[in-house]
Interface confidence: low
Amino acid sequence: ELVPTSSWNISSELNKDSYLTLDEPMNNITTSLGQTAELHCKVSGNPPPTIRWFKNDAPVVQEPRRLSFRSTIYGSRLRIRNLDTTDTGYFQCVATNGKEVVSSTGVLFVKFGHHHHHH
């Protein structure tokens, strides 16, 4: 069974001017074949954090017109269109401001549904 987790780690050597906060745990999604899913990484920090995406511990690679991630006002958003069952997995975002690191993990489950288009 896939069990979603959220975790965060902060190094002990902090600049008093710097901070990094996981504002909200990542959402979990259960959806159907062919649908679109959005995972949100909600972090804030100073300096502005670098955010990376991983699926099952592997870096996520953007796919033209299907899978993309982009910076948002709240952190980063990962969007996957035309979902396939192979998209099921743990998705983790890792954010760093150069001194601290926070991460959150959510689960995307793509199921065979009654209301989807077969390819």
């Epitope: 670098t50 592997a58 870096p59 996520v60 991630f69 910076s71 890792v94």
Partner: antibody, heavy 122, light 107 residues
Amino acid sequence: QVQLVQSGAEVKKPGASVKVSCKASGYTFTNYYMHWVRQAPGQGLEWMGIINPSGGSTSYAQKFQGRVTMTRDTSTSTVYMELSSLRSEDTAVYYCARDSSSWYSGWYFDLWGQGTTVTVSS
Amino acid sequence: AIQMTQSPSSLSASVGDRVTITCRASQDVRAHLAWYQQKPGKAPKLLIYAASSLQSGVPSRFSGSGSGTDFTLTISSLQPEDFATYYCQQFNSYPITFGQGTRLEIK
């Protein structure tokens, strides 16, 4: 000292495959992601992909999908990059480059191998 | 893919000069930019990361600035060992991409 040592130069014929090795020393091999970057003669730098030496997971640039395979051997602290179906445009210096950060990735490179020249010629 | 464009492609300067190289991204890369120095027959060397952070061991005459789409690498007083080719690289999104390089030559 901390270093990456790559295998020697290769000459290959079009259609063949090449496997380049990169041996890490002086640091904990499994704590740092490894990238491969290539540079054609007189040209700029081109990122090929990344491997997590701990779990072996990989991500490849779309341009190389289906032709490149990155693997690792933790017992020897070595990563490998194999490129198949070689063509003349693959003639380049191939570098392994360590990711800047341990366990989370910064996607920039603080340690480079010396480079391996691969020549593809009939 | 994000395109990185450096200017100038080459420049000539003298020891002691102040030199600025620019790098422009085709879309916003925030501060996710690095600069490298490469000498002939050698691997690149990291100079600057996160647009303005100096890599450990790199002389303080090197500095970086910028965010979003426009970035600069400045060498405050050129030394003989600084003549090389310089590359910018964005690490905001896949695929990682580099500028075409700026060749710095002795005048």
